[in-house]
């Protein structure tokens, strides 16, 4: 019979041959061969693989860093990751919580619309037209540009997000 | 690396005043914004004050206004919190942090004990 050029579900091609693949948990030791079933080893003590693999080696459990304000939400399995979460009061910098911070900043262009408390970070806004962010900041509110008509001066060069306006004298018409 | 080191702390009654120090080093201080934050017994962080790398703007939770005032001093690389008026309820680990507000610019506080 020909050799297979593709493999069923949960199997996988090797020397024209389709082997099986080993199950979450389990790492390859050996090749199937005409003869013998694919050899799977399960994962030690703090190592997984979550999918069905042919992989020789299993991952490293994530490692929590307190000294990052990282705790573990979820142990990890032969099967599963570990999950870090941060430490009460703080917030992950990212979905996969790498690190944690006490409160994340506003951009320049950004305002605080709410501080952050014990459970939730910062919330930011943009800064709507006539107002003006210009600093990264954990409380500061878009602030609104300078009126320069109320100080008797005339707008030299236009706000933006991030920057206020300039004001200057009044032209002078001369005589 | 950033220290971050707080001191001033210690047991005041009520009513009374302190004013609390963080002292940073290994890294600039001007510029930056400064938080003050406390941990009471039991209970979660709370955010007490902050002031703009400026110095130009500063915030205070409702729990502290009109009795805490922030302040900062960039000659000595050294922020400030005057407490007056202290009541029970202000007995916490008082921290100081800087931003980017990692736990690497994160002191290890100074305990204020408001008791008679």
């Known amino acids: 019979p020909e050799p297979p050029t593709a493999c069923r579900e949960k199997q996988y091609l090797i020397n024209s041959q389709c082997c099986s693949l080993c199950q979450p948990g389990q790492k390859l030791v050996s090749d199937c061969t005409e003869f013998t079933e694919t050899e799977c080893l399960p994962c030690g003590e703090s190592e997984f693989l979550d999918t069905w693999n042919r992989e020789t080696h299993c991952h490293q459990h994530k490692y929590c860093d307190p000294n990052l304000g990282l705790r573990v939400q979820q142990k990890g399995t032969s099967e599963t990751d570990t999950i870090c979460t941060c430490e009460e009061g703080w917030h992950c910098t990212s979905e996969a919580c790498e690190s944690c911070v006490l409160h994340r900043s506003c951009s320049p262009g950004f305002g605080v619309k709410q501080i952050a408390t014990g459970v939730s970070d910062t919330i930011c806004e943009p800064c709507p037209v006539g107002f003006f962010s210009n600093v990264s900041s954990a409380f500061e509110k878009c602030h609104p540009w300078t009126s320069c008509e109320t100080k008797d001066l005339v707008v030299q060069q236009a706000g933006t997000n991030k920057t206020d306006v300039v004001c200057g004298p009044q032209d002078r018409l001369r005589a | 690396e950033v220290q971050l080191l707080e001191s001033g702390g210690g047991l005041v009654q009520p009513g009374g005043s302190l004013r609390l120090s963080c002292a940073a080093s290994g890294s600039t201080f001007a510029g930056y914004e400064m938080w003050w934050v406390r941990r009471a017994p039991g209970k979660g962080l709370e955010r007490v004050s902050?002031?703009?790398?400026?110095?130009?703007?500063?915030y205070y939770a409702d729990s502290v206004k009109g009795r805490f005032t922030i302040s900062r001093d960039d000659s000595k690389n050294t922020l400030y919190l005057q407490m007056n008026s202290l009541r029970a309820e202000d007995t916490a680990v008082y921290y100081c942090a800087r931003d980017p507000y990692s736990f690497d610019y994160w002191g290890q506080g100074t305990l204020v004990t408001v008791s008679s």
């Open positions: 902050a002031i703009s790398g400026s110095g130009g703007s500063t």
